[in-house]
């Protein structure tokens, strides 16, 4: 559940993401079928650079509806190739 994920992230707060935590997050997201808004909100709360650490291919699978969870500062450290994927999603999210 999302609460279990939050508890796990709380224990690791302030530490770099370990391979074990990364694997659990990956399984959690895959189990949900996509990186939904609530999950993304939770992840970026603990890991502000989460989106910018993903590949453009991974970012392309983030549904536009989840972009509502993203704050401008979450994208501060993304590179242009990542932003090329995220900006159209943001426009689409705000149009809808």
């Amino acid at each position: 559940s999302l609460e279990t994920l939050k508890a796990l992230l709380e224990v690791n707060k302030g530490h770099e993401m370990s391979p074990q935590v990364a694997t659990l997050i990956d399984r959690f997201v895959k189990g949900r079928g996509q990186l939904d808004k609530d999950t993304l909100d939770t992840l970026t709360a603990f890991y502000p650079g989460y989106l910018c650490s993903l590949s453009p291919e991974e970012l392309s699978s983030v549904p536009p509806s989840s972009i509502w969870a993203v704050r401008p500062q979450d994208l501060d450290t993304c590179d242009p190739r990542q932003l090329d994927v995220l900006y159209p999603k943001a426009r689409l999210a705000f149009q809808n």
Partner: nanobody, 116 residues
Framework: EVQVVESGGGLVQPGGSLRLSCGVS????????MRWYRQTPGNQREWVAS????????GYADSVKGRFIISRDSAKNMMSLQMNSLKSEDTAVYYC?????????WGQGTQVTVSS
């Protein structure tokens, strides 16, 4: 403590090649994107290239596409930038950037000068 160190800079003639390396020490364990930026005197840092944690996919600025090749050895926490067909416009300090879900780490930079 995470440390990022660049090496391989130097003076090269136009049309020449140079290989930059970036080493990361410390606990950068998962999900990191590694990038090269460059900065010329008085200018903002310009993104050059990225290599992403998932599948090693890459991205390049238009100004270096087809000339520069970014690669990484995740086991050694190393990244390289092979720079070919160098131009005077490539003269800059090149910085390695390591993006994790938690932080962004920068190196001190390495100077590349392209001049005849």
């Amino acid at each position: 403590e995470v440390q990022v160190v660049e090496s391989g800079g130097g003076l090269v003639q136009p049309g020449g090649s140079l290989r930059l390396s970036c080493g990361v020490s410390g606990s950068i364990l998962a999900l990191n994107t590694m990038r090269w930026y460059r900065q010329t005197p008085g200018n903002q840092r310009e993104w050059v290239a990225s290599i992403y944690s998932s599948g090693g996919s890459t991205g390049y600025a238009d100004s270096v596409k087809g000339r520069f090749i970014i690669s990484r050895d995740s086991a050694k926490n190393m990244m390289s930038l092979q720079m070919n067909s160098l131009k005077s416009e490539d003269t800059a300090v090149y910085y390695c950037n390591v993006q994790t879900p938690l932080n962004v780490y920068w190196g001190q930079g390495t100077q590349v000068t392209v001049s005849s």
